[in-house]
């Protein structure tokens, strides 16, 4: 025998109190799949969260973090403080990158500079707290009169592009 509730579409619930009639989800609730016996309460984006997408009868609200914070976890479960480039967020707060490491983003930890010599290249531009070193041609390629030219910064660094 087919369950009468299976006919209830997303945005409704199967109301046992009303002879298993499909009733619309009450305000501030939703059902994202059919055949639900209850509607779920909409997520509220408060405090460090702000609403990215409003709740509808068929979809939960989506939150994002306010300025100065970034999301962690699926569906932005938690907001974590941004640091400045050149810093990393430790469990004790934002801390400058140690010498020999860099962070060009507002999140994550400081990464060791590239060691150009491992690939037989020379350092063209020194690293900073905010930028990796730039490797140039191998030392043998730099004849005495050749000039080292600092190239323009790349248009896109890892981590900055959308998926």
């Amino acid at each position: 025998l087919q369950d009468p509730c299976s006919n209830c579409p997303a945005g409704t619930f199967c109301d046992n109190n009303r002879n298993q009639i499909c009733s619309p989800c009450p305000p501030n609730s939703f059902s994202s799949a059919g055949g639900q016996r209850t509607c779920d309460i909409c997520r509220q984006c408060k405090g460090v969260f702000r609403t990215r997408k409003e709740c509808s009868s068929t979809h939960n609200a989506e939150c994002e973090c306010i300025e100065g914070f970034h999301c962690l976890g699926p569906q932005c479960t938690r907001c974590e403080k941004d640091c400045r480039p050149g810093q990393e967020l430790t469990k004790k707060g934002c801390k400058d990158c140690c010498f020999g490491t860099f962070n060009d983003q507002k999140r994550g930890i400081c990464r060791p500079w590239t060691n150009c010599s491992l690939d037989g290249k020379s350092v063209l531009v020194n690293g900073t707290k905010e930028r990796d070193v730039v490797c140039g041609p191998s030392p043998a390629d730099l004849s005495p009169g050749a000039s080292s030219v600092t190239p323009p910064a790349p248009a896109r660094e890892p981590g900055h592009s959308p998926q």
Partner: antibody
């Protein structure tokens, strides 16, 4: 969707070199660092190094320095790992794995692995 | 370089809770990631940054990290959870930034 597809199994003689490829799709290749990790038979996971596909900058685990070279070809969204002077204990499955967009988090997508067998 | 220590194996009956530990000096100050590795399959990230699950990972998998020990907890374990589990951290201060624990084989009894 994000996919990393690696080249097929290789059999090499001791002293030879092997070059494993990892073709990325479903995202901007130059936007995410690529790491290489290996697992020898009956052993655990071992991190080998990373490459920044945008600049070509690399960092290798000290154990592999002088024997490993990581490169990329941005025109075909492919990363490469070359290991030279192979020994029998380099027999392992080699994986490429993508960093999720910032350093300090877990490696979120992995290739299927490439078995490299070193045998005389 | 930094060392992560895991027990070689953990055995648990179906439906019970498995706890896999990962020890390291002041590991609580680092961000720990956990991977599940099944034979002939690529590793899968199951927990990142101590306690966050990537989408698609069930809620019964959780992580915690403080002091000198990080813990991966699998509640209501199923036969499909049988695998090797590896903890991992990044250690920028060493010449080997990517560090994995030795791995723990989760054995489902019965």
């Amino acid at each position: 969707q994000v996919q990393l597809v690696q080249s097929g199994a290789e059999v090499k003689k001791p002293g030879a070199s092997v070059k494993v490829s990892c073709k990325a799709s479903g995202y901007t290749f130059t936007g995410y660092y690529m790491h290489w990790v290996r697992q020898a038979p009956g052993q655990g996971l071992e991190w080998m190094g990373w490459i920044n596909p945008n600049s070509g900058g690399t960092n290798y685990a000290q154990k592999f320095q002088g024997r490993v070279t990581m490169t990329r070809d941005t025109s075909i969204s492919t990363a490469y790992m070359e290991l030279s002077r192979l020994r029998s204990d380099d027999t392992a499955v080699y994986y490429c794995a993508r960093e999720p967009g910032y350093y300090g988090s877990g490696l979120d997508y992995w290739g299927q692995g490439t078995l490299v067998t070193v045998s005389s | 370089s930094y060392v992560l220590t895991q027990p070689p194996s953990v055995s648990v009956a179906p439906g019970e809770t498995a706890r896999i530990t990962c020890g390291g000096d002041d590991i609580g100050d680092k961000r720990v990631h956990w991977y599940q590795k099944k034979p002939d399959q690529a590793p899968v990230l199951v927990v990142y940054e101590d306690r966050y699950r990537p989408s698609g990972i069930p809620e019964r998998i959780s992580g915690s990290n403080s002091g000198n020990t990080a813990t991966l907890t699998l509640s209501r374990v199923e036969a499909g959870d049988e695998a090797d589990y590896y903890c991992q951290v990044w250690d920028s201060s060493s010449d080997h930034p990517g560090v994995f624990g030795g791995g723990t084989q989760l054995i489902i009894l019965g």
